[in-house]
């Protein structure tokens, strides 16, 4: 680093990356106070949270949310039927699989209604703000004497549908080796040290095929190989939190 | 949301330049670290060059003196200027973003360079090419 340094953990949770936000609402009346922004993921297609900050309005304000489908056989908007609270404030809305239709432009309409001219509307490609479960499972097996194979699953989503990144490292490594995996839930070390204890995790996010997802699951549970001797420092070698 | 959207590569001979341009939406560059990694032919993710909001730069050993990261706040740009480029540069290159976190000396000691894993949001990548 030039001045000073700027690393961190890699394995934080998924909202100390950045937090995906909508496109600007559009607001649709006359000068008012504008309302927050809504920010919508769909968690491996099992449901979607749409969230605002509740703490940006000037008083307690149980604000709705609407939503509908451009698209679709009902072009009404349709309310909201599980509400998210914070300190007995409404802040998001969880929207159940049932409802989610990933590739169809998802409208959304946050309001007042003590207001009602106070509402604005956004629209959100649901395809490019899924993401995945942490993949699991992950398995380890001999291919031959020196080489090892690494699979994972992930739950619910097409594995075409993913692209992974497998970071891997030996005892004696003081820094990961990084994969990106295209599609297949598998990778293969072609020479592996049987006297090393080898570490291996993956995170995976929806793209490119099926989504444009640009962010990324958190990492799976590590799964280890080899030699079980005591590492001789290991604080160095620990996993980053 | 948060929108990462590379462009600016190409197929270039060995010793030519590319500047690679990444247009940022849907956050502010206050609190972020902005990075280019790279994926090589043979699949392996390396961070390249990282820039934090106050300017702070990072590069790897390997574009050191060759490419510079830079970015332009007003239009929500991030670059990076490669010269000199040679074919081992030759990958798919993504612009990649986190928030800024305050880190201590001791983890970066823990360390020897940074991760793509660090970084959790991610473009779609730019394929560059450089031929001998």
């Known amino acids: 680093w030039s001045s000073k340094v700027l690393m961190s953990s890699a394995n934080e949770d998924i909202k100390a990356d950045l937090i995906l936000t909508s496109t600007a609402p559009e607001h649709l009346s006359a000068p008012t106070l504008p309302l927050p922004e809504v920010q919508c993921f769909v968690f491996n297609i099992e449901y979607m949270n749409c969230t605002w900050n509740s703490s940006s309005e000037p008083q307690a304000t149980n604000l709705t949310l609407h939503y509908r489908y451009k698209v679709s056989d009902n072009n009404t908007f349709q309310e909201c039927s599980h509400y998210l609270f914070s300190k007995e404030i409404t802040s998001g809305c969880q929207i159940q699989k049932e409802d989610i239709q990933l590739y169809q432009t998802f409208v959304v309409q946050l309001q007042d209604p003590q207001k009602p001219q106070r509402r604005a509307v956004q629209k959100l490609n649901l395809q490019n703000l899924v993401i995945p479960r942490a993949p699991e499972n992950l398995t380890l097996s001999n291919l031959s004497e020196s080489q090892l194979e690494l699979r994972w699953k992930s739950r619910h989503i097409k594995e075409r549908c993913l692209q992974y990144l497998v970071q891997y490292r030996s005892n004696r490594d003081r820094s990961w080796t990084e994969l990106i995996v295209n599609h297949e839930p598998r990778f293969s070390l072609p020479s592996v040290d049987e006297l090393k204890r080898y570490t291996f995790r993956v995170r995976s996010r929806y793209n490119p095929i099926c989504g444009s997802s640009q962010q990324w699951s958190k990492w799976s549970q590590p799964v280890h190989w080899g030699s079980h001797t005591v590492e001789e420092n290991p604080s160095l070698f620990a996993l980053e939190a | 949301q948060v929108q990462l959207q590379e462009s600016g590569g190409g197929s270039v001979q060995a010793g030519a330049s590319l500047r690679l341009s990444c247009s940022v939406s849907g956050f502010t560059f206050d609190e972020s670290v902005m990075s280019w990694l790279r994926q090589g032919p043979g699949n392996e993710c390396d961070a390249v060059a990282i820039i934090s909001s106050d300017d702070n730069t990072y590069y790897d050993d390997s574009v050191k003196g060759r490419f510079t990261i830079s970015e332009d706040n007003a239009k929500n740009m991030v670059y990076l200027q490669m010269n000199s480029l040679k074919p081992e540069d030759t990958a798919v290159y993504y612009c990649?973003?986190?928030?800024?976190?305050?880190?201590?000396?001791?983890?970066?000691?823990?360390?020897?360079?940074?991760?793509?894993?660090?970084?959790?949001?991610w473009g779609q990548g730019t394929q560059v090419t450089v031929s001998s």
């Open positions: 990649a973003a986190r928030r800024r976190r305050p880190v201590y000396d001791s983890d970066y000691e823990l360390r020897p360079r940074p991760l793509c894993g660090d970084f959790g949001v």
